[in-house]
């Protein structure tokens, strides 16, 4: 630690007098304090020697040695007064900026320990301090108003008792600065704005602050607008808004409008953007496919997004048939708006029926006209399957019928034993039908398919097997030949695979 | 070794307010003086003022209306703002350590600051 | 208009002494201690002689400093090409109560 010379801390001094401060370390050192006229300084190695052969009463002040070089970073002081009777403060400052809640020192000096008893703070033109300002004194340092106020920022002067009156020290701003947690906060409505040409719009643009140092204006396309402001402090923060009216818009008028406002902490920004159209319109679109297949016994939820300027006049849902007359019930259409302009409709199916295949239709309505979006709904289903011996020119024959969603495949197995269903081990022969005639494919109802298999014995210790499958789902008929005529089984249950 | 720098933008428009941030590293900013210092091109050095780590402030009466500087101790940094300027007010700004005699050592290495619409 | 007066520029050939001056006042020269700085083109200001005559850590000793009165001057011996730069002085201001400098010597090294 560095040692100063003369070893006090404090000196007190008269006008005119020589003072000469000498600091000694290890290392080189380097003297710290008010800076002020007279000082002459001298540096020789390890030792910094501060002196003027003329002080003033502005050469009152603590004065620090440090040693850059030391780790610990250590320090020494001591306190100058240069006690001239005209002149009982040194002021080191005109201006004290601080944040609220913050100690606030106000820099004022006393050049004579002596007076220390009688000293006050005043505000300017001898005005009292404000209710509740808590403060205290220090003759190094000078007063310091504790956890200062906004409102506490004022201008303050020293006082201090010589010979019974009081002399007042050259005043002192203090700026106590509100605590500013980050760029004011925006708002710019409306979020996203459409009109037809030649009718009127308003976009306003309003920022606020706890602090009334901000800017806030509106920019089109990154040209600033000139709008007049209208200010307000509400809910202890300061409002800024600027509001553009257009009575007749026109194509000029669209594009990007930006909201900035920015204050010592920064620049916030919001956009919008602006839509001059010549004319209403209405547009409707599914992220869906438009051709939907859902499996019997699942639900489906149909989607339609749209777009419209003026807003709609009216919407619904329409069944178009094959089936019924039967129309989708209110409760399960559902409105959801994303915004002004875009809208999602969706109408939820659950637990589809056979019966509620078909084209259901989205109409919507605006000044713009009537819109429609119309969705083919087709029904899967797993095959049914039955077989039947029957004799097709002279020849015997089995006849397979299939039906189900997609077009079912099928696959004949002769297998060995009385059996519901031919299993691995057992199967002798197996055929696939690649081609099996479709007897009938209407839009949104089954497929039926018929295969044949010629058979010239029948083996009476044999089954025959229909099997068919689509991606839903397979199903198979046994026909097992008894001497008594031929005899069909159906499997135990119907296979089933929603 | 304390070093300094200055940062801010480099262009401001007329009437607009000037807003500079000096760092300090390599050393405490508290219990020191710190000073702004500008320099037009071509031109010589004039000071702006000073700030001392507990707010207090001493600006150039030339300038005094207009400036304001605070510090912050908690991020080794003192600012400057200059508000209302104009095309006279385009300089090299510096930021720099007073020291006890009035001296300025060391500088930051200097922020060009244009003021022009 | 700068408070303190230098000369516009100075030159000296390698090796030579140059001398470069500045006057000012009894607010400011008069009364106070006088600094000077060395600024290298495109560089910001160091601190070349303090408290008149005073050379940081650093600072060869063909530099040095006095002051006499109102006026203060800075010597540099044995010019080199690189003390090529412009010089100011600056000084305490008691009416300021704040430094004030000079407007600056162009030094060229012939």
């Known amino acids: 630690i560095p040692v100063i010379e003369p070893s006090v801390p404090e000196l007190v001094v008269k006008p005119g007098a020589t003072v000469t401060l000498r600091c000694v370390g290890n290392g080189s050192v380097e003297w710290d304090g008010p800076p002020s006229p007279h000082w002459t300084l001298y540096s020789d190695g390890s030792s910094s020697i501060l002196s003027t052969n003329n002080a003033t009463f502005q050469n009152t002040g603590t004065y620090r040695c440090t040693e850059p070089g030391d780790p610990l970073g250590g320090s020494a002081a001591i306190h100058l007064y240069v006690k001239d009777p005209a002149r009982p403060w040194n002021v080191l400052a005109q201006e004290v900026v601080v944040f609220e809640d913050q100690d606030a020192l106000l820099p004022c000096l006393l050049t004579d320990p002596v007076l220390e008893a009688g000293v006050s703070l005043v505000r300017v033109r001898g005005r009292p301090l404000m209710r509740h300002t808590n403060y205290s004194f220090s003759p190094w340092h000078g007063f310091t108003i504790h956890r200062a106020k906004f409102i506490q920022s004022q201008d303050y002067q020293c006082s201090a008792l010589m010979g019974g009156r009081k002399v007042m020290s050259i005043s002192i701003r203090l700026k106590v600065q509100k605590v500013i947690p980050g760029p004011p906060a925006l708002t710019l409505v409306p979020a996203e704005l459409v009109r037809i040409r030649g009718e009127a719009a308003q976009i306003v643009c309003s920022a606020s602050s706890v602090d009334v140092n901000f800017d806030v204006f509106l920019q089109h396309n990154n040209t600033k607008l000139a709008i007049p402001q209208q200010s307000d402090f509400h809910n202890n923060r300061y409002q800024k808004v600027l509001t553009l009216n257009l009575d007749q818009v026109d194509f000029q008028h669209a594009g990007n409008y930006s909201c900035v406002a920015s204050n010592v902490q920064g620049k916030h920004s919001t956009s919008m953007f602006f839509r001059v159209v010549e004319s209403a319109y209405l547009n409707l679109s599914s992220e869906q496919n438009l051709i939907q297949e859902v499996t019997v016994g699942e639900g489906l939820n149909l989607k339609v997004m749209v777009e419209a300027y003026p807003g709609l006049q009216g919407f619904n849902w329409t069944y178009l048939g094959p089936f019924s007359d039967h129309q989708p019930e209110p409760k399960l259409a559902n409105a959801t708006t994303k915004d002004t302009y875009r809208h999602t409709f969706t109408l939820s199916l659950p637990r589809l029926k056979p019966s509620e295949a078909g084209r259901y239709s989205f109409l919507a309505r605006n000044p713009g006209g009537w819109r429609a979006l119309t969705f083919e709904l087709t029904l899967r289903y797993p095959p049914e399957v039955s077989v039947i011996w029957t004799f097709i020119n002279g020849s015997g024959t089995l006849l397979c019928a299939a039906s189900g969603y997609p077009q079912p495949n099928v696959t004949w197995l002769q297998c060995s034993g009385h059996t519901d269903r031919c299993d691995e081990a057992q199967v002798l022969q197996v055929w696939d039908d690649p081609y099996p005639e479709v007897l009938s494919q209407e839009p949104f109802h089954k497929v039926t398919v018929q295969s044949l298999l010629t058979v010239e014995t029948l083996e009476h210790n044999q089954t025959y097997e229909c099997r068919a499958h689509n991606s839903v789902g397979s199903g198979s008929w046994a026909f097992i030949p008894i001497s008594a005529g031929a005899h069909t089984h159906p499997p135990d249950e119907f296979l089933f695979t929603p | 070794q304390v070093q300094l720098q200055e940062s801010g933008p480099g262009l401001v428009k007329p009437s607009e307010t000037l807003s500079l941030t000096c760092t300090v590293s390599?050393?405490?900013?508290?219990?020191?003086?710190w000073s702004w210092i500008r320099q037009p091109a071509g031109k010589g050095l004039e000071w702006i003022g000073r700030?001392?780590?507990?707010?207090?402030?001493k600006y150039n009466p030339s300038l005094k209306s207009r400036v304001t500087m605070s510090v912050d101790t908690s991020k080794n940094q003192f600012s400057l703002k200059l508000s209302s300027v104009t095309a006279a007010d385009t300089a090299v700004y510096y930021c720099?350590?007073?020291?006890?005699?009035?001296?300025?050592?060391?500088w930051g290495q200097g922020t060009l600051v244009t003021v022009s619409s | 208009q700068s408070v303190l007066t230098q000369p516009p520029s100075a030159s000296g050939t390698p090796g030579q002494r140059v001398t470069i001056s500045c006057s000012g006042s009894?607010?400011?020269?008069?009364?106070?201690?006088v600094n000077w700085y060395q600024q290298l083109p495109g560089t910001a200001p160091k601190l070349l002689i303090y408290?008149?005559?005073q050379r940081p850590s650093g600072v060869p000793d063909r530099f040095s400093g006095s002051k006499s009165g109102t006026s203060a001057s800075l010597a540099i011996s044995g010019l080199q090409s690189e003390d090529e730069a412009d010089y100011y002085c600056?000084?305490?201001?008691?009416?300021?109560?704040?430094?004030?400098f000079g407007g600056g010597t162009k030094l060229t090294v012939l």
């Open positions: 600056a000084a305490w201001d008691d009416s300021l109560n704040g430094p004030v």
């Open positions: 700030i001392y780590t507990s707010g207090s402030t």
């Open positions: 408290s008149n005559n």
């Open positions: 009894s607010s400011n020269i008069g009364s106070n201690t």
């Open positions: 720099a350590r007073e020291g006890v005699t009035g001296g300025f050592d060391p």
């Open positions: 390599g050393g405490s900013i508290s219990s020191y003086y």
